[in-house]
Structures are given as structure tokens and as C-alpha cells.
């Protein structure tokens, strides 16, 4: 039994880091493998992660962490019984994938303005709370070409757009994702999408 693709890990910078790797053949990850991880600080103890299958030869493990700070570094040991298959390390602050925003809501009752709001996925005492910026994706269910991205570079989790920038009388969907420049993170997953019917009064045209 050998590791074909070494574990790569990403952290949500809150409580979970996810490590994925591939074995050289079909593997029952949960029964055959264990991933041990230990924070490199005095008085820290090793913890065991039981991996799950992620495709025939792929494994994934969710490492639980009480909290994360920038100085944290973990040793990782991948075991198959008594055999050490791989040894490495992981610094969560250098491999951050933020949590996805939640509670995306489209408020359509503000005159001819659409107000989109969502929730910051982090609590106020987490470092990322004040460092997230967002991308909002809006698309038409009827017209695949009607697809747009709005970059929200301020901290407030909201976006206002004129309803007239979208077509009237058809349904749209929106979703939002987050990233943090300070840690050069990857983008989060997209939030669940929300749907609304776009309608507004066309301005009266005089001839």
C-alpha cells in the first residue's frame, strides 16, 4: 500500500481543516488508514482522524481544531496499521479556504432597488471576520448568457443594484462566495442560491 498523491490540506481558519490524498489502488480509507495530527506547541497532544473514501483510491479527512492562530503548525502522520506511509506538516494560515457565506436573501421591496444581504460565516472574535470580501453571482434561469459577477470589496455583507440592470418579468438566482486577501486565501464554496422574480416598472417613454 502506497500513497500516490500526498495529502494536501486546507483550513477554514476556525475549527476544521480538510486533507485529501490518493492511494495507489482501491482503499477502504476508514478501516485501513489513520491520519495523526499534532499542533507543534508544548502540551499539545496527537489526535487521530479517521478518513472517509473520496472515490475509489481517494481519501479525505476532517481535522478538528479548537481554534487557529497564524503561528500554528501541525505535524501529519499517515498510518496504515503499524506502517508509516507518509509524514508531513501543515500550516493552516498558509492554506485557508474560508467558510461559505450563508442566509443569502434578496429584498425586492425597496422601490426599484434590489438589496442582497448575507451572513458573514465567522464569529466576531475570529480574525477573518473583518477581512472577508465577497463575489456575488447573479444569473437568469431563462438565459444562460445572462450571467454576471459583482465584486463586493467593502466589509458589509450586502449589495445594492438597480432592478433595471436586470431584465423584468423573469426569474433570477443569486449566490455569494468569500475570500480574504490578508491570508491570500482561495475562494470559499458558493453559498446556496436563492431565487426571485425580477419585476419593476419600465420608465414611461414620451414620443
Amino acid at each position: 500500500m502506497k500513497v500516490l498523491q500526498e495529502p494536501t490540506c486546507v483550513s477554514d481558519y476556525m475549527s476544521i481543516s480538510t486533507c485529501e490524498w490518493k492511494m495507489n489502488g482501491p482503499t477502504n480509507c476508514s478501516t485501513e488508514l489513520r491520519l495523526l495530527y499534532q499542533l507543534v506547541f508544548l502540551l499539545s497532544e496527537a489526535h487521530t482522524c479517521i478518513p472517509e473514501n473520496n472515490g475509489g483510491a481517494g481519501c479525505v479527512c476532517h481535522l478538528l481544531m479548537d481554534d487557529v492562530v497564524s503561528a500554528d503548525n501541525y505535524t501529519l502522520d499517515l498510518w496504515a496499521g503499524q506502517q508509516l506511509l507518509w509524514k508531513g506538516s501543515f500550516k493552516p494560515s498558509e492554506h485557508v479556504k474560508p467558510r461559505a457565506p450563508g442566509n443569502l436573501t434578496v429584498h425586492t421591496n425597496v422601490s426599484d432597488t434590489l438589496l442582497l444581504t448575507w451572513s458573514n460565516p465567522y464569529p466576531p472574535d475570529n480574525y477573518l471576520y473583518n477581512h472577508l470580501t465577497y463575489a456575488v453571482n447573479i444569473w437568469s434561469e431563462n438565459d444562460p448568457a445572462d450571467f454576471r459577477i459583482y465584486n463586493v470589496t467593502y466589509l458589509e455583507p450586502s449589495l445594492r443594484i438597480a432592478a433595471s440592470t436586470l431584465k423584468s418579468g423573469i426569474s433570477y438566482r443569486a449566490r455569494v462566495r468569500a475570500w480574504a486577501q490578508c491570508y491570500n486565501t482561495t475562494w470559499s464554496e458558493w453559498s446556496p442560491s436563492t431565487k426571485w422574480h425580477n419585476s419593476y416598472r419600465e420608465p414611461f417613454e414620451q414620443h
Epitope: F41, L42, L43, E45, D66, V69, S70, A71
Partner: antibody
């Protein structure tokens, strides 16, 4: 809210024994190392002992090694310090502290141990 | 064991002053250093850990810096509640050790 509360401090004669307790609440006790730190009257802080979250590893200052024993009962969220062969120089306020990465994030109010004849 | 030396041992300052306290380790300790504040009759309180990380709830006028053997605690605008004794502590190796303390009192 994290809370740690020491008890068991008392006046004891040289050579005597005492057991301190520390009741913890507001966090997952078994996930964190715990420590004892003491402060002699009018003096600075001195680390005494630490124990890992599982209780599997213990560490002591040279000044108490062989005389003091740290232990924990994770089912009761309680930390202990058994102190034997006490000396006058052990007189101090003993603080229980919740450890995180080797640092003492939360402290109790302390319990006074006086060793005197 | 690692010996920590603090300077000054005491400092007299006024409200609004900038106060700097240094802690020097007898050997390199990377960033494994914390700062605590203690007021008379009270338990110590963690201010800074891992040299520069502010503990939750601690005012931003407190900051820490340094790595290796030389570390600094800075209070940018001293407030009345900041008059206390400050200790550094290393967590790089056993036994954990504290500095002797720096007393900040009113000028």
C-alpha cells in the same frame, strides 16, 4: 464563560500534605492542558506543574519534583495537585490555569497555602 | 532552564503616556512568549501570547513584538486601569519560566 475555581488551600505544618482542587467550567475540559502556577507573598510568578488534556503526560518544576503530583478527572472537570513533604518555601498563592499552546489563558482567583509550625 | 530578564524593573508614567517593557531570554525561544498583567490581590491576566497575538477582550492599545531572544510589550496610551505589574513567560521549553516583573506606577 470560562471559569476555574481553586480550593483546598490551608495552613499546614512542615512535612505535611495537602490536596488542592480546581473545578473548571465553560469549555471542553478534556481538550485542554491545565497547569498550576504559584506566587509567594510579595514575589513573582513560578510555574509548578502541567498536565495534558488526556492526563497522559505530566511536567514539574525541579523545586517540586518528587513531592507534588498533578492529576485530573475529566469526568468531573476537575484538576488536582497533591502536595507532600511541604516546606516553608512552598508558602504561596496557588493558581490553577487553563492552558493553550503553553500559555495560561484563564486563571482562577487562587488559593493560599501556608506552611508553618 | 531559560532565564527571562525584564527591563525596567519599574517605571513611573502618566495617563496617556506610551510605555515600553522589554523581555530578554537567555536563549532563543522563537515566538513562544506571553505577557500578563497582574493587579494587587488579583490573579494574572493574559494580554499577549505567541509574542504578538492579542488575547480576546484585551484593548488594542496593548501590543507585543519580537522573536528569538528580544521581546517588547507596548502600551500606546496608558489608561488609569493599566497601572499594574507586567510579567513575560516563555513556553518554548520546560520548565516554563516567568520574568521577574515590571511594575508600572503613577508618576
Amino acid at each position: 464563560e470560562v471559569q476555574v475555581l481553586e480550593s483546598g488551600g490551608n495552613l499546614v505544618q512542615p512535612g505535611g500534605s495537602l490536596r488542592l482542587s480546581c473545578a473548571a467550567s465553560g469549555f471542553t475540559f478534556s481538550s485542554y492542558a491545565m497547569s498550576w502556577v504559584r506566587q509567594a507573598p510579595g514575589k513573582g510568578l513560578e510555574w509548578v506543574s502541567s498536565i495534558t488534556g488526556s492526563g497522559g503526560s505530566t511536567y514539574y518544576a525541579d523545586s517540586v519534583k518528587g513531592r507534588f503530583t498533578i492529576s485530573r478527572d475529566n469526568s468531573k472537570n476537575t484538576l488536582y495537585l497533591q502536595m507532600n513533604s511541604l516546606r516553608a518555601e512552598d508558602t504561596a498563592i496557588f493558581y490553577c490555569a487553563k492552558d493553550n499552546r503553553g500559555f495560561f489563558h484563564y486563571w482562577g482567583q487562587g488559593t493560599l497555602v501556608t506552611v508553618s509550625s | 532552564e531559560i532565564v527571562l530578564t525584564q527591563s525596567p524593573s519599574s517605571v513611573s508614567a502618566s495617563v496617556g503616556d506610551r510605555v515600553t517593557i522589554t523581555c530578554r531570554a537567555s536563549q532563543g525561544i522563537s515566538n513562544r512568549l506571553a505577557w500578563y498583567q497582574q493587579k494587587p490581590g488579583k490573579a494574572p491576566k493574559l494580554l499577549i501570547y505567541i509574542a504578538s497575538i492579542l488575547q480576546r477582550g484585551v484593548p488594542s492599545r496593548f501590543s507585543g513584538s519580537g522573536s528569538g531572544t528580544d521581546f517588547t510589550l507596548t502600551i500606546t496610551r496608558l489608561q488609569p486601569e493599566d497601572f499594574a505589574t507586567y510579567y513575560c513567560q516563555q513556553a518554548n521549553s520546560f520548565p516554563f519560566t516567568f520574568g521577574p516583573g515590571t511594575k508600572v506606577d503613577i508618576k
